[in-house]
């Protein structure tokens, strides 16, 4: 049964994972940002389900396309480079969702946007938040 | 209601320079990219280049770098693209045209201006 | 440089279902736009993202992607259907835009 000094710490992970996930969508969704309609065009997969901390498979295999797209924001948008700032997201997920477990990650028919990917993903570290709390 | 209306075509003999305008309204002009678009008579539609809403990004199709140049005055509203060194390929109709809301679709366009190039 | 290939023609009769593609190497990591362009008019955008509608669109136009290739469905096609309809995307890198030869849809 997990203790609750590794529920904190995931709590925290998660909590870092959303500040992440949020800075990125607060430094491209805005129309200060000269290459939104750019980045709109890359296409990212969804989970077909995401509730559990083993569906951070999903957006671990989504990284990369992340930083393409990123690759394309002026660094001032960020206070890290793109490699940087997703290697720092690849830890923590790596870190929630184990190494010992194999999941196989399902994709919804639809894809997304930036935009409404990040918004996605957001979303489940809040309702995995809110169920820690 | 959004409105492009594009000036500054006409005939020009080849080697020569023209420059193209496009007006907007109806939009914070300053908010959004902008494209320009040709087509020549009876063939396809070919991006040509586009700009950034702030003019600091600029993109252009191969067969127009190094001799066209798109930019933008967003206190007037208006985009331009300078057109140099013309040839006869490039006789077509422009259109400027621009996403809006948050898609990276050409939602507006104007109606075009025909450039003719030739001796 | 980036190309994506759509049929020259397409013919359809009246009521039938249209359906029109457009293929590229980089389509299954880059959106797919659909424009409509009459006689003598402006084109219109008729589907972004692959398979959104814009306002104003009927229900009859429908978009839909498969790795490498775009398609636009025509529904129940009508005699005002008859256009010239062009894809449009991204190259690999995002920074190229590029449209299709363009498909002439002929109702008959």
């Known amino acids: 049964a997990p203790t609750s000094s590794s529920t904190k710490k995931t709590q925290l992970q998660l909590e870092h994972l959303l500040l992440d996930l949020q800075m990125i969508l607060n430094g491209i969704n805005n129309y200060k940002n000269p290459k939104l309609t750019r980045m709109l065009t890359f296409k990212f997969y969804m989970p077909k389900k995401a509730t559990e901390l083993k569906h951070l498979q999903c957006l671990e295999e989504e990284l990369k396309p992340l930083e393409e797209v990123l690759n394309l924001a002026q660094s001032k948008n960020f206070h890290l480079r793109p490699r940087d700032l997703i290697s720092n997201i690849n830890v923590i997920v790596l870190e929630l969702k184990g190494s010992e477990t194999t999941f196989m990650c399902e994709y919804a028919d639809e894809t997304a946007t930036i935009v409404e990917f990040l918004n996605r993903w957001i979303t489940f570290c809040q309702s995995i938040i809110s169920t820690l709390t | 209601e959004v409105q492009l209306v594009e000036s500054g075509g006409g005939l020009v003999q080849p080697g020569r320079s023209l420059r193209l305008s496009c007006a907007a309204s109806?939009?914070?002009?300053?908010?959004?990219?902008m494209h320009w678009v040709r087509q020549a008579p009876g063939k396809g539609l070919e991006w040509v280049a586009d700009?950034?809403?702030?003019?600091?990004?600029?993109y252009y199709a191969d067969s127009v770098k190094g001799r066209f140049t798109i930019s933008r005055d967003n206190s007037k509203t208006t985009l331009y693209l300078q057109m140099n060194s013309l040839r006869p390929e490039d006789t077509a109709v422009y259109y400027c045209?621009?996403?809006?809301?948050?898609?990276?679709?050409?939602?507006?366009w104007g109606q075009g201006t025909l450039v003719t190039v030739s001796s | 440089s980036y190309e994506l290939t759509q049929p020259p023609s397409v013919s359809v009769s009246p009521g039938q279902t249209a359906r029109i593609t457009c293929s590229g190497d980089?389509?299954?990591?880059?959106?797919a736009y659909w424009y409509q362009q009459k006689a003598g008019q402006a084109p219109v955008l008729v589907i972004y993202?692959?398979?959104k509608r814009p306002s104003g669109i009927p229900e009859t136009l429908s978009g839909s992607s498969s790795g490498t290739t775009a398609t636009l469905t025509i529904s129940g096609a009508q005699e005002e259907d008859e256009a010239d309809y062009y894809c449009?995307?991204?190259?690999?890198?995002?920074?190229?835009?590029?449209f299709g030869g363009g498909t002439k849809l002929t109702v008959l």
């Open positions: 045209a621009t996403p809006y809301y948050d898609s990276s679709g050409l939602d507006y």
């Open positions: 109806g939009f914070t002009f300053s908010y959004y990219g």
């Open positions: 700009i950034s809403n702030d003019g600091s990004n600029k």
């Open positions: 980089a389509l299954p990591k880059r959106f």
């Open positions: 993202e692959d398979n």
């Open positions: 449009y995307s991204t190259d690999n890198t995002g920074g190229l835009w590029v």
